[in-house]
């Protein structure tokens, strides 16, 4: 990940002092109430403080901002817009802050924002323009290089009447603003599928983490344009088999390493091509750990040890002979 300063020699602001002078204009580089600041490390930490909104008086020097473990609920448009702007802010961590809504333009006026972590927030409403800031068909490029969105799926009863996958992808693709994104983490989001157009519009990706989802198939997903992709994490999904088109695309990426552990591979006749490919490829990391889950007779067999005779399909019986 990107190099970020570790905080040292933090100064805390005294809450009673801050409240006593809240009517005054903020001092240039004071530390917000309930936060710890280190100008030397250019870091502000407002962690586990049950904050309900982003502090207004963030110091202009802040480069790394931790707002984790709070109760923010909603991130409005221009949540970090300040005069003068927070021109140095490069890394923003909002994980575990009970956010359920991120509105359009929430991260506008942060010209240096390279790394954003929204993990562990139940995002029932992520605006399509949360990252692009505008509804133009082509927006100004976002400076984001790393976007961490692990476990942002809300409880089922809090989801809108729309596809969660679709909501996230709409935010990733709006205005083509994230063309410079190099790391995207979408682990633990109960994704059932990956919309086919999402990867084609993120050509700079080096690392993509889709682990611990519920992906059943990659048949309609194209990796062809991801020339720079180096790691693709697909562990702990519901993948049954990878078909020839996917295998060929992955093999064609010059730097790719794929992680496929803990998927319920179905070792029948449809698996033959994948087994042949696994035996030859250097793309898959830990390929010797991949085992069959189905059918029952194949359970726990190592994929690399299978041969074509092992991979059969039960004949399809005519309807008159089928039993329930």
């Amino acid at each position: 990940s990107s190099p970020t300063s570790s905080a040292s020699s933090f100064s805390s602001s005294a809450p009673f002092l801050a409240s006593a002078v809240s009517a005054q204009p903020p001092l240039p580089d004071q530390c917000p109430a309930l936060c710890e600041c280190s100008e030397a490390a250019r870091t502000v930490k407002c962690v586990n403080r049950n904050l309900t909104e982003v502090p207004t008086d963030l110091p202009a020097y802040v480069r790394n901002l931790f707002l984790t473990g709070n109760q923010l609920a909603v991130l409005p448009a221009g949540a970090f817009a300040r005069r003068p702007p927070l021109a140095e802010l490069a890394a923003l961590n909002l994980s575990g802050s009970r956010l359920d809504e991120v509105r359009a333009g929430a991260f506008e006026h942060l010209p240096s924002l390279r790394q954003l972590d929204l993990s562990h927030n139940p995002l029932a409403d992520l605006s399509p323009f949360a990252f692009s800031g505008s509804n133009a068909s082509v927006s100004a490029p976002s400076p984001l290089v790393e976007l961490i969105l692990n476990h942002i799926v809300p409880p089922e009863d809090e989801r809108q009447n729309r596809s969660f996958e679709g909501m996230v992808v709409a935010a990733l693709l709006a205005g083509r603003a994230l063309q410079g994104l190099r790391r995207l983490e979408l682990a633990s989001n109960h994704f059932l599928y990956l919309p086919r157009d999402v990867l084609a519009q993120l050509p700079s990706l080096r690392h993509l983490d889709l682990s611990n989802n519920s992906l059943v198939s990659l048949t309609y997903v194209s990796f062809r344009n991801l020339t720079h992709l180096e790691s693709l994490h697909l562990e702990d999904n519901a993948l049954k088999v990878l078909h020839n088109g996917t295998l060929a695309e992955l093999q064609g990426l010059p730097h790719i390493r794929v992680f496929l552990d803990n998927n319920p591979w179905v070792c029948d006749c449809h698996m033959a091509d994948m087994v042949t490919w696994l035996k030859e490829t250097e793309v898959v990391q830990g390929k010797d750990r991949l085992t069959c889950a189905y059918p029952e007779k194949m359970r726990n067999r190592v994929l690399l040890e299978l041969n074509s005779a092992d991979l059969d399909c039960d004949p399809i019986l005519p309807p008159s002979l089928q039993t329930s």
């Epitope: 990940s1 990107s2 190099p3 240096s112 390279r114 290089v145 790393e146 410079g180 190099r182 790391r183 700079s204 080096r206 690392h207 720079h228 180096e230 790691s231 010059p254 730097h255 790719i256 390493r257 250097e282 793309v283």
Partner: antibody, heavy 117, light 113 residues
């Protein structure tokens, strides 16, 4: 986390030498790694790079004579140098590339190679 | 091959001075901002100062800053300190269909006036 070069020394023109770079604190196979050299009193000169899965790229002048490889089990990077010339005399550095940005964020202290008869 | 031209090749300055070094690339660096700056002191390995054209590396004092995009880049030291007398190098990363290429500028030696 650190990298340490070794294998430098005196070699005759036309000779060969293999430099090593041992990584500690991180897995070499997870990073791109590069070799850079610097002749005495001169600037830095990029030699080549090896990607995480093993693809290699070289400066045009280094192609054919210099080869970068890696032994993941030993967590070691290598630079094989053949047909050495006097102008190859330099300090040779190995450097790790950031996992996100294309920048050298970890350098060894270098090993001196002298090509002379 | 891509060429990075640094200027000046050397300069003399005093403690407290504002110092500016420029780096010009013969073609755009990858993604227009894959340009890094390093500081090197005699007998030592280079040290990363700035990456991605303008992002300060961890632990680097904020008197160092970088700017630029595409082919033209600048390193600025806002107030020169005694420990800043060293040689500075820019480094660009390039990508084409045939793969990756890296290049260094010729260096700028910052000396005490």
């Amino acid at each position: 986390q650190s990298v340490e070069e070794s294998g430098g020394g005196l070699v005759q023109p036309g000779g060969s030498l293999r430099l090593s770079c041992a990584a500690s604190g991180f897995s070499l196979s997870s990073y791109w790694m590069s070799w850079v050299r610097q002749a005495c009193g001169k600037g830095l000169e990029w030699i080549g790079i090896i990607a995480g899965r093993g693809s290699t790229y070289y400066a045009s002048w280094a192609k054919g004579r210099f080869t970068i490889s890696r032994d993941n089990s030993k967590n070691t990077l290598y630079l094989q140098m053949n047909s050495l010339r006097a102008e190859d005399t330099a300090v040779y550095y190995c450097a790790r590339v950031s996992s996100i940005y294309y920048t050298f964020n970890l350098w060894g202290q270098g090993t001196l190679v002298t090509v002379s008869s | 091959a891509q060429v990075l031209t640094q200027s000046p090749s050397s300069l003399s300055a005093s403690v407290g001075d504002r110092v500016t070094i420029t780096c010009q690339s013969s073609q755009s660096v990858y993604s227009n901002n894959e340009l890094s700056w390093y500081q090197q002191k005699p007998g030592k390995a280079p040290k990363l100062l700035i990456y991605y054209a303008s992002t300060l590396a961890s632990g680097v004092p904020s008197r160092f800053s970088g700017s630029g995009s595409g082919t033209d880049f600048t390193l600025t030291i806002s107030s020169l300190q005694p420990e800043d007398f060293a040689t500075y190098y820019c480094q660009g990363s390039y990508y084409s269909g045939s793969g990756w290429y890296y290049a260094f500028g010729g260096g700028t030696k910052v000396e005490i006036k």
